[in-house]
C-alpha cells in the first residue's frame, strides 16, 4: 500500500508511517515501527505535558517565586502546570501574572479612590479642598476637615490637603 501522507488525530507521521502520539502526562521514548507501538513514559515528579505529544522531555512545573510575590494557587499534575497567584497585598504586573508587585500606597495629600485587588493596583486621588490625608496608605481615603463650628470653636489654622484644620476657642468679647 501507498505510504500515508497524513495521519489521523492523535497520530503523527514518521518514517512514512503513522504513529500514536503520547497522551497528556507522558513523553515519547521511542517512535513506533512496523512491528511495535509508540513507547511513552509518564512525566516525573514536578513535570508535566498538557497535550497529546511527541515530546522527548516533559516541561518543568512553573515555580511560583516568592521573591516575585507569587504563591501556588493550584499545584500542577502530570497533565497540568502549576498555577501561581499573588501574595496578599500584591498584584499582578500583567494579565498573565508572571510576577507581582506590592500595592502602591497613596502619599500624604492623596487618598485611596479604589483599594487594590490581586489584579489591579491602588488608585489614588488628590484630596480636594475640605479634605486631607496626612499618611501614606493603601487603604485610607481623604478625611474631611474637622468642622470647628459644630464644636462651637473657630478655625485657628487653615487645613491643607495634608493637614486638618486646627480649632480653637472663640475670642470672648471684653466688657
Amino acid at each position: 500500500p501507498e505510504p500515508p501522507t497524513a495521519c489521523r488525530e492523535k497520530q503523527y507521521l514518521i518514517n512514512s508511517q503513522c504513529c500514536s502520539l503520547c497522551q497528556p502526562g507522558q513523553k515519547l521514548v521511542s517512535d513506533c515501527t512496523e512491528f511495535t507501538e509508540t513507547e511513552c513514559l509518564p512525566c516525573g515528579e514536578s513535570e508535566f505535558l498538557d497535550t497529546w505529544n511527541r515530546e522527548t522531555h516533559c516541561h518543568q512545573h512553573k515555580y511560583c517565586d516568592p521573591n516575585l510575590g507569587l504563591r501556588v494557587q493550584q499545584k500542577g499534575t502530570s497533565e497540568t502546570d502549576t498555577i501561581c497567584t499573588c501574595e496578599e497585598g500584591w498584584h499582578c504586573t500583567s494579565e498573565a501574572c508572571e510576577s507581582c508587585v506590592l500595592h502602591r500606597s497613596c502619599s500624604p495629600g492623596f487618598g485611596v479612590k479604589q483599594i487594590a485587588t490581586g489584579v489591579s493596583d491602588t488608585i489614588c486621588e488628590p484630596c480636594p479642598v475640605g479634605f486631607f490625608s496626612n499618611v501614606s496608605s493603601a487603604f485610607e481615603k481623604c478625611h474631611p476637615w474637622t468642622s470647628c463650628e459644630t464644636k462651637d470653636l473657630v478655625v485657628q489654622q487653615a487645613g491643607t490637603n495634608k493637614t486638618d484644620v486646627v480649632c480653637g476657642p472663640q475670642d470672648r468679647l471684653r466688657a
Epitope: D50, H57, H59, Q60, K62, N67, L68, G69, D81, T93, S94, E95, A96, E98, S99, V101, L102, H103, R104, D121
Partner: antibody, heavy 113, light 108 residues
Framework: VKESEGGLFKPTDTLTLTCTVS????????VSWVRQAPGNGLEWIGG???????YYASWAKSRATITRDTNLKTVTLEMTSLTVADTATYFC??????????WGPGTLVTVSS | AFELTQTPSPVSAAVGGTVTIKCQAS??????LAWYQQKPGQPPKVLIV???NLASGVSSRFKGSGSGTEFTLSISDLECADGATYYC??????????FGGGTEVVVK
C-alpha cells in the same frame, strides 16, 4: 531560548527574527525581545505573555509585531521600516512583563545601505 | 513617557571596596525593579528582583534596596570579576517596562 540568525539588512527592509524555546511551554511562560546597539544599553522592544497578550515599548508600537506558535515553540519578532539605528544585538528572554532570568545568546542585526 | 535614570557612570573602586549605583523612576513602581549584570559579549544576568531580593545563586555581596521611585544597588568586597555594566529594569506594568541607561563599574 535561542534566537535565529540575524544578518545584513538594507534600510526600509523588514526584519523577522524567531526565538525557539525548549524545556518550557509558551502556555506557561511569556517571551520578550530586548536589543542592544553596539556600545549602548539594553532596550526593551516588547513581549508576549503566556496568555498570548502582546506588549510593546511606546517607540516600537508602530513598527514591531510579536507573535507566537505554541506548537512549534517559537516566538517571532517582525520589525518594519528598518533604519541604521536598528543595528543591534537582538536578545530573546523568557518572560512577559516580569524579570528575565533566562536569555538567549543574542543575534547581531546590521542595517546598512 | 516613563523613564529610569541611572547614576553615576562610570564608577570605579578598588578591590575590596564598595560601590553604590542609583536608579530613579519617573513615577512610582512600588518594588517592581530588577538589577542585572552584563559583561561584554554576554547576555545580562539577573542579580536582584523585587527591588531587594537576591536572585538564585547570586553572591550576598550584592544588595538591593529602595521602593517607589528611588532604588540602590550596592556591591561590597569588590572583586575583579565584578567589573561589568549594571542595569536596572522596571517591570511594574507593560507601560513601565524599561531598562535604565546602565552604569559601568571599573574595579581597580
Amino acid at each position: 531560548v535561542k534566537e535565529s540568525e540575524g544578518g545584513l539588512f538594507k534600510p526600509t527592509d523588514t526584519l523577522t527574527l524567531t526565538c525557539t524555546v525548549s524545556g518550557f511551554s509558551l502556555s506557561s511562560y511569556g517571551v520578550s525581545w530586548v536589543r542592544q546597539a553596539p556600545g549602548n544599553g539594553l532596550e526593551w522592544i516588547g513581549g508576549i505573555g503566556s496568555d498570548g497578550s502582546a506588549y510593546y515599548a511606546s517607540w516600537a508600537k508602530s513598527r514591531a509585531t510579536i507573535t507566537r506558535d505554541t506548537n512549534l515553540k517559537t516566538v517571532t519578532l517582525e520589525m518594519t521600516s528598518l533604519t541604521v539605528a536598528d543595528t543591534a544585538t537582538y536578545f530573546c528572554a523568557r518572560g512577559g512583563i516580569t524579570v528575565y532570568a533566562i536569555w538567549g545568546p543574542g543575534t547581531l542585526v546590521t542595517v546598512s545601505s | 513617557a516613563f523613564e529610569l535614570t541611572q547614576t553615576p557612570s562610570p564608577v570605579s573602586a578598588a578591590v575590596g571596596g564598595t560601590v553604590t549605583i542609583k536608579c530613579q523612576a519617573s513615577q512610582s513602581i512600588s518594588n517592581g525593579l530588577a538589577w542585572y549584570q552584563q559583561k561584554p559579549g554576554q547576555p545580562p544576568k539577573v542579580l536582584i528582583v523585587g527591588a531587594s531580593n537576591l536572585a538564585s545563586g547570586v553572591s550576598s555581596r550584592f544588595k538591593g534596596s529602595g521602593s517607589g521611585t528611588e532604588f540602590t544597588l550596592s556591591i561590597s568586597d569588590l572583586e575583579c570579576a565584578d567589573g561589568a555594566t549594571y542595569y536596572c529594569q522596571s517591570y511594574f506594568s507593560s507601560s513601565s517596562t524599561v531598562f535604565g541607561g546602565g552604569t559601568e563599574v571599573v574595579v581597580k
